[in-house]
Structure formats: structure tokens, C-alpha cells
């Protein structure tokens, strides 16, 4: 059960309710564990993890990435800018996580868990950011057409896209986790 779900607190006797910071930290680590499992299946069934042709597929993707200007790195850290970037980035990743559904055979449930846990994480972060400026949500129409486009790719590109999404999401979450620990 993901840390964000109510049964977590009920299931553990004498467990205090998780604090907001602890919920966020545990949620990210839970998602990262899920990504590791998905990457294992991806790397086992194709040679994408060793491929040098990633640039070809990356041209079709606009995956969220942490940049210096986002204020999430130690140099140039800005907690408010960074928190907005984390939430915006996670919202942008949602379409890619939707794409990952049905991309896994033995880890289908894990892919669903990563998707659902990310939604919960976004909710936690939005609570933390309640005093910050409004966060822009991706346009549903744009997301729908992107999803269609990704699903229409040939098999090799779909495998490569899956690998790139998982790798990018892992990197994004790791950067987010480091930054959020200061907040």
C-alpha cells in the first residue's frame, strides 16, 4: 500500500499520523522503488538501457527536467520557485505515466501504483504550496494528442520512450527529494 493511502496509518498499530514532510519523503521513496522495479523489467526485455540512440527518441519527448533556473539545486536554491517547479513537473509527467500503463507485462500493477502514488504526491505538495502562486496545469487536449502520438510510434521507439520516461522521472524525483528535505 503506498504511504499516501489511509490504510497505512491504520495498519500500523501505535503509529502516529505521518507529518506532512514525512508523507512527502516516504511517498517519493515509494515511487522511486516502483520506478526501479519497472526499469528492471524494461532493461531485461530490451537492450534500451545500453542503447546509444536515445537522442533519436528524445526529439519526440518534452520530458520535465530540472534546470538551474528552477531553483532546486544547491547553487541558486529558491524554495518557492523550486516547489512550483516540482509540482508543475509532476503534473507534466502525468501524461507520460499514463503512457506507461499497458507497457508492462509482469509489472502492470507496479506501473499503476507509480501513477496513483504520483497523484497522491501532487496532492501533498499542493497542500505544502497553498500560499504560493497558482500552478499551471497542462492542457488536457494537448496531453491527449501527445498520448496518441506516442502510442502510434513503432515498437523500437515505444520501448525507447518507456526507458526515457522512467529514467527522466527517476532523475526528477531524486532532485525533488533532495530539495524538499530542506523545506
Amino acid at each position: 500500500v503506498p504511504p499516501g493511502e489511509d490504510s497505512k496509518d491504520v495498519a500500523a498499530p501505535h503509529r502516529q499520523p505521518l507529518t506532512s514532510s514525512e508523507r512527502i519523503d516516504k511517498q517519493i521513496r515509494y515511487i522511486l522503488d516502483g520506478i526501479s522495479a519497472l526499469r528492471k523489467e524494461t532493461c531485461n526485455k530490451s537492450n534500451m538501457c545500453e542503447s546509444s540512440k536515445e537522442a533519436l527518441a528524445e526529439n519526440n519527448l518534452n520530458l520535465p527536467k530540472m534546470a538551474e533556473k528552477d531553483g532546486c539545486f544547491q547553487s541558486g536554491f529558491n524554495e518557492e520557485t523550486c516547489l512550483v517547479k516540482i509540482i508543475t513537473g509532476l503534473l507534466e509527467f502525468e501524461v507520460y505515466l499514463e503512457y506507461l500503463q499497458n507497457r508492462f507485462e509482469s509489472s502492470e500493477e507496479q506501473a499503476r501504483a507509480v501513477q496513483m502514488s504520483t497523484k497522491v504526491l501532487i496532492q501533498f505538495l499542493q497542500k505544502k504550496a497553498k500560499n504560493l502562486d497558482a500552478i499551471t496545469t497542462p492542457d488536457p487536449t494537448t496531453n491527449a494528442s501527445l498520448l496518441t502520438k506516442l502510442q502510434a510510434q513503432n515498437q523500437w521507439l515505444q520501448d525507447m520512450t518507456t526507458h526515457l520516461i522512467l529514467r527522466s522521472f527517476k532523475e526528477f524525483l531524486q532532485s525533488s527529494l533532495r530539495a524538499l528535505r530542506q523545506m
Epitope: H14, L18, T19, E22, F77, R181, M183
Partner: antibody, heavy 119, light 106 residues
Framework: EVQLVESGGGLVQPGGSLRLSCAAS????????MHWVRQAPGKGLEWVAK????????YYSDTVTGRFTFSLDTSKSTAYLQMNSLRAEDTAVYYC????????????WGQGTLVTVSS | DIQLTQSPSSLSASVGDRVTITCSAS?????MYWYQQKPGKAPKLLIY???NLASGVPSRFSGSGSGTDFTLTISSLQPEDFATYYC?????????FGQGTKVEIK
């Protein structure tokens, strides 16, 4: 040299106020969360409070909530602990500490400043 | 709040001895840290996130454990290691500390 220097401690009567300062030097202050930890004479360590690098989020122990306020002046690379309604049980050496970037560990500590609450 | 119980509260050992200090948490914790404190001085970080050695800390110090049971080991005690050791946990706020273990010269 990376260091934190606390000041502002002293003798104060119960119910009184005191403001502690923690001046940072030798590192860029802006990305780090800061903490206060105290140690009563001959006793163990007790965490008091944390402030995020830009001051947007503060966290306090139950024993000081509503009485202590943590603030920052990033232009001076200084953290402050405003202590009101002081009690005898607040008597302790107060340490400020820096939180290690990307972790929850407290990696750099000041030498401490003694606060004595007594009539 | 999460309670941390260290054992022993104090111990006597000789230079070269292998020393083990344990820290038991009242419930499972997310992160565990170990600090060394000498009289009149500030605490010094030794171990973070259960087992990572802090910068500048000699490799004779090591940390292990998970869940509720954690251990600090000094593989070969040196004269400068006589001090009080504290475990500290973070699983949300507040951070809490163990009561300390004083390592004295036998």
C-alpha cells in the same frame, strides 16, 4: 572556514524574553535549512526548531511552539531565535546547526550559547 | 514522539577495543544519525542515513541497522574517541535523540 557562531545568551527571569543570533560564515547561507538544538546542563540533546532556507516553512517542538519564533536575515547570513515567556526548563546551551544539503542530517554546529532562566 | 533508547548508557573500554552502541526506536524510523560530543563542545556528525560516513570521519566508525534497531560500531577505539555518543532520528518533526552513551577509559 565553515562556521556558525551563536550569541545573545544570558540570564533572564521567568516570563522574560531573549533573542539568540546565529551568524554563518565560510559557506553560502542561502540553500541551507537551519536548526536550533538545546542541551540542559548535564542532560542530553533536544531538537527545538527548523527553518527552511528562505524562511517559508518553520517547524517547532511541542515544548516551544507558540513561545519561540525562528527567523532569518539572509542578507546577513544570520538566523535568529526569539524566545518569549521563558521558563526555568528552557535553561540550556542553545546550538544552531546547519542541515546537510539533500539530507536531514545536521552537519555543522555552532559552539553554543548558554541561556539561564532564573529569578 | 518517537523514543530512542541507547544501550549501554555508559561503558569502559581500552584503546584498540571494538565498541558497539545500540539504539532502539519505539517505532520504525526513516533516517538514523549518530553524533559524537566531547565535554564543553558541540556535537559532531559521524553517520547519516543509517550508514553513510560524514565528511572527515575516520573509517573505524560505521553505522548499520534499519527499522527500529541501529548500531554504531567503532572497530578499534582510539584515545580521541572517548566521548558521549548520541543517536538521532528523523521521521518527520520533531527530530528526537537518544539519551546518550558515555564511552570512558578503562
Amino acid at each position: 572556514e565553515v562556521q556558525l557562531v551563536e550569541s545573545g545568551g544570558g540570564l533572564v527571569q521567568p516570563g522574560g524574553s531573549l533573542r539568540l543570533s546565529c551568524a554563518a560564515s565560510g559557506f553560502t547561507f542561502s540553500p541551507f535549512a537551519m536548526h536550533w538544538v538545546r542541551q540542559a546542563p548535564g542532560k542530553g540533546l533536544e531538537w527545538v526548531a527548523k527553518i527552511s532556507p528562505g524562511g517559508s516553512w518553520t517547524y517547532y517542538s511541542d515544548t516551544v511552539t507558540g513561545r519561540f519564533t525562528f527567523s532569518l536575515d539572509t542578507s546577513k547570513s544570520t538566523a535568529y531565535l526569539q524566545m518569549n515567556s521563558l521558563r526555568a526548563e528552557d535553561t540550556a546551551v542553545y546550538y544552531c546547526a546547519r542541515q546537510l544539503w539533500g539530507y536531514y542530517a545536521l552537519d555543522i554546529w555552532g559552539q553554543g550559547t548558554l541561556v539561564t532562566v532564573s529569578s | 514522539d518517537i523514543q530512542l533508547t541507547q544501550s549501554p548508557s555508559s561503558l569502559s573500554a581500552s584503546v584498540g577495543d571494538r565498541v558497539t552502541i545500540t539504539c532502539s526506536a519505539s517505532i520504525s524510523v526513516s533516517y538514523m544519525y549518530w553524533y559524537q560530543q566531547k565535554p564543553g563542545k558541540a556535537p559532531k556528525l559521524l553517520i547519516y542515513d543509517m550508514s553513510n560516513l560524514a565528511s572527515g570521519v575516520p573509517s573505524r566508525f560505521s553505522g548499520s541497522g534499519s527499522g527500529t534497531d541501529f548500531t554504531l560500531t567503532i572497530s578499534s577505539l582510539q584515545p580521541e574517541d572517548f566521548a558521549t555518543y548520541y543517536c538521532m532520528q528523523w521521521s518527520g518533526y520533531p527530530y528526537t535523540f537518544g539519551q546518550g552513551t558515555k564511552v570512558e577509559i578503562k
